[in-house]
């Protein structure tokens, strides 16, 4: 557990022509506030919700009213730090998104109106417990200067706030005021207690009793803002000029790196590590361009068409935002049809289809006959990616689940009597008629209108012949139906199992990519 802290130093028009004179619209006064959003900077295959590490909103700043003809100054800012508590380990790599919002205080219907003025995005590697990191970012014509750090909250310690220091019941080898740090018995740690009165906002300490100042602040308790004109060339949060860092003999003393660059000493000289968008020996050259790679997640950077935007990011699938920093939950659009399970693998969407469906979006219905869809001995007839059931006599409906009266349609001709039977129906024909449906007249001379009867069937016994014929036809049909059903089911199951094994293999490969 710990806290991420963000200190906004200044927000105002950036250098160069075309800088805005006021953050307010023509409708009247406004005030600023900030929103910070933290996202773990893991490989983007790991799906995460927006601001998964947390977010915070600042208080509203003082009301700003544009002075006619006056140049836009550093704008009045809200007081205090923005603090984002985190419960679990500090990830080390993270995306920091800072939004500057404008609250218009003119006569608005329904209360104040809010609009996003600027958004900056920074992907950083930062150890917990380290010193404040300072940065300057441009967002269109605006410039934001800020510092940030991550610190653990006891009993958590370490660069990821994962080690816990707890007092032990056993006697400790550590000196007074120190406690052993689990899991290493011989390691003793004490939370650094800064010098009394050390500024909470502008100072920090790594050793007990010290008070080290955040860049731009000086004095024994870090209460005195450094002069911006003769020293660092940085706009501080106050126009008061009451102090200045005096460069010492070291090449990095006084920090020769402008625009938030960090200085490291080299033999007889220094080297500036510049924040994104600044270059030169002293980070004095500014302006973010496509060559800086401002688009996250592989986004395509295109030079902006208007002077206010130096570039535009064209994002890969699954990402959005001015810098492609926002992950889109593409599964929320429910692209998988027929109840398929959606998997957003980051670089691709995969649909895990329910049995009987296939295709990239589970759009193909395979459940023609594989799912034994026809009940009560009905046979499944395939066609055009769909299926229909040819029902056994006595059953009806889409899946042959509805019991039907086979005699309801009066199927026996010429006054024959209909009897429902387990395999369908049987007609008892009136004298003078024969056939499965009593459709053939028997001539008086004993010769029917049928072709010659097979041996063993006497034309003089039409009812018996009809019943036998019906039973034989029905039995053959049932046996044939069962054979066809078994063969087609085996074929389909083999095909489906093969497809399933292939799909599972592909998905396993994708998830391990």
């Amino acid at each position: 557990a710990g806290v991420f802290e963000l200190q906004i130093h200044s927000f105002g028009p950036g250098p160069g022509p075309g800088a805005p004179r006021s953050p307010c619209s023509a409708r009247g006064p406004c005030r600023l506030f900030f929103r910070v959003c933290l996202k773990p900077g893991l490989s983007e295959e790991a799906a995460e919700s927006p601001c998964a590490l947390g977010a915070a909103l600042s208080a509203r700043g003082p009301v700003y009213t544009e002075q006619p003809e006056a140049p836009a100054p550093d704008l009045p800012l809200p007081n205090g730090l923005l603090q984002v508590p985190f419960r679990d380990a500090w990830p080390g790599t993270f995306s920091l998104i800072i939004e500057t919002w404008r609250e218009e205080l003119g006569d608005q219907i329904g209360g104040p109106a809010w609009s996003l003025l600027a958004r900056v995005t920074r992907r950083r590697r930062l150890a917990a417990g380290g010193p404040w990191a300072r940065d300057i970012q441009r967002a269109g014509a605006w410039e934001l200067r800020f510092s940030y750090r991550a610190r653990c909250e006891l009993p958590a310690v370490g660069t990821a706030c994962t080690r816990l220091c707890r007092p032990r019941s056993a006697p400790s080898r550590c000196g007074p005021g120190l406690r052993p740090c689990a899991p290493l018995e011989d390691e003793c740690e004490a939370p650094p207690v800064c010098r009394a009165g050390c500024s909470l906002e502008h100072g920090f300490c790594e050793q007990p009793g010290e008070c080290r100042c955040l860049e731009g602040w000086t004095g024994p308790l870090c209460m005195v803002p450094v002069s911006t004109s003769s020293c660092l060339g940085l706009r501080g949060p106050s126009s008061t000029t009451t102090g200045c860092l005096v460069p010492g003999p070291g090449p990095c003393d006084g920090n020769p790196c402008a625009n938030g660059g960090s200085c490291s000493e080299t033999p007889g000289s220094f080297e500036c590590t510049c924040p994104r968008g600044f270059y030169g020996l002293r980070c004095e050259v500014s302006g973010v361009t496509c060559a800086d790679g401002p688009c996250f997640n592989g986004g395509l950077c295109v030079g902006g068409a208007d002077p206010d935007s130096a570039y535009i990011c064209h994002c890969p699938p699954g990402f959005q935002g001015s810098n492609c920093e926002k992950r889109v939950d593409r599964c929320s659009l429910q692209p998988c049809r027929n109840g398929g399970l959606c998997l957003d693998l980051g670089h691709a969407l995969r649909c895990r289809c329910r049995a009987g469906f296939a295709g990239p979006r589970c759009e193909h219905d395979l459940d023609d006959c594989a799912g034994r869809a026809c009940a009560n001995g009905g046979t499944c007839v395939e066609g055009g990616g769909a299926h229909r059931c040819s029902c056994a006599l006595g059953f009806g409906g889409r899946n042959c689940r509805e019991r039907a009266d086979p005699c309801a349609a009066r199927p026996c001709a010429h006054g024959g009597r209909c009897y429902a039977h387990f395999s369908g129906l049987v007609c008892a024909c009136a004298p003078g008629y024969m056939g499965a449906r009593c459709e053939f007249p028997v001539h008086p001379d004993g010769v029917s209108a049928l072709p010659a009867a097979p041996p063993g069937l006497r034309p003089g016994d039409p009812q018996r012949a009809g019943v036998i014929a019906v039973i034989v036809v029905v039995v053959i049909a049932i046996v044939a139906g069962i054979v066809v059903l078994v063969i087609s089911r085996k074929k389909r199951m083999a095909k489906y199992e093969k497809a399933e094994i292939k799909e599972m293999g592909e998905m396993h490969r994708e998830l391990n990519a």
């Epitope: 900077g41 800086d292 790679g293 688009c295 592989g298 395509l300 699938p317």
Partner: antibody, heavy 117, light 107 residues
Framework: EVQLVESGGGLVKPGGSLRLSCVAS????????MNWVRQAPGKGLEWVGQ??????????HYAESVKGRFTISREDSKNTVYLQMNSLKTEDTAVYYC????????WGQGTTVTVSS | NIQMTQSPSSLSASVGDRVTITCKAS??????VSWYQQKPGKSPKLLIY???NRYTGVPSRFSGSGSGTDFTLTISSLQPEDFATYYC?????????FGGGTKVEIK
């Protein structure tokens, strides 16, 4: 001006190995995804693999045809991306290009790899 | 993998002609299609991204259109420097895949 310069191509026997390099200039290299794309003689373009950023733990992705044989790495301090090719096959013969980003916006001039006995 | 089928594989045209090249995806790729131009012995250059957006520095005679599965690259008035091979590529689904190319030759 953005420049990507590949090197390391040459003639190698089947089963052999080769390491290609691509040096970038004119861009903040450490902020760019890097890809290798190849083109067999007289054929079309085929994506080979990709390496992402330090903040992505240098995640790599490969085409099925090269998985397990090719390895991509990068050295941000040298503005360089590498393609280590092992167990080479005749069908790996191609011009190999390094490109940036997800949409292959910047391309190098290419280096030729010939796998033949 | 998504297949991209380009047609024609080659065409002959004269300077000033209007040229249309089509690309068909084996499944829906939204508008995540790019077009590249490659001259003999040179590396490909990005012309169009997002199906219809011209990349920085690309002349206005090049335009792209389409969405879903059918895409078109149009050169409104062919110039001598446009004789080259053109490739479409899809970026909707990983891995990215390309069409077989269309060679535009002088008639």
């Amino acid at each position: 001006e953005v420049q990507l310069v590949e090197s390391g191509g040459g003639l190698v026997k089947p089963g052999g190995s080769l390491r290609l390099s691509c040096v970038a200039s004119g861009i903040t290299f450490s902020n760019f995804w890097m890809n290798w794309v190849r083109q067999a003689p007289g054929k079309g373009l085929e994506w080979v693999g990709q390496i992402r950023l330090k903040s992505d733990d240098y995640a790599t992705h490969y085409a099925e045809s090269v998985k397990g044989r090719f390895t991509i790495s990068r050295e941000d301090s040298k503005n360089t991306v590498y393609l280590q090719m092992n167990s080479l096959k005749t069908e790996d013969t191609a011009v190999y290009y390094c490109t940036t980003g997800y949409y292959f916006d910047y391309w190098g001039q290419g280096t030729t790899v010939t796998v033949s006995s | 993998n998504i297949q991209m089928t380009q047609s024609p594989s080659s065409l002959s045209a004269s300077v000033g002609d209007r040229v249309t090249i089509t690309c068909k995806a084996s499944e829906n790729v939204g508008t995540y299609v790019s077009w590249y131009q490659q001259k003999p012995g040179k590396s490909p250059k990005l012309l169009i991204y997002g199906a219809s957006n011209r990349y920085t520095g690309v002349p206005s005679r090049f335009s792209g259109s389409g969405s879903g599965t059918d895409f078109t690259l149009t050169i409104s008035s062919l110039q001598p420097e446009d004789f080259a091979t053109y490739y479409c590529g899809q970026f909707y689904s990983f891995p990215s895949t390309f069409g077989g190319g269309t060679k535009v030759e002088i008639k």
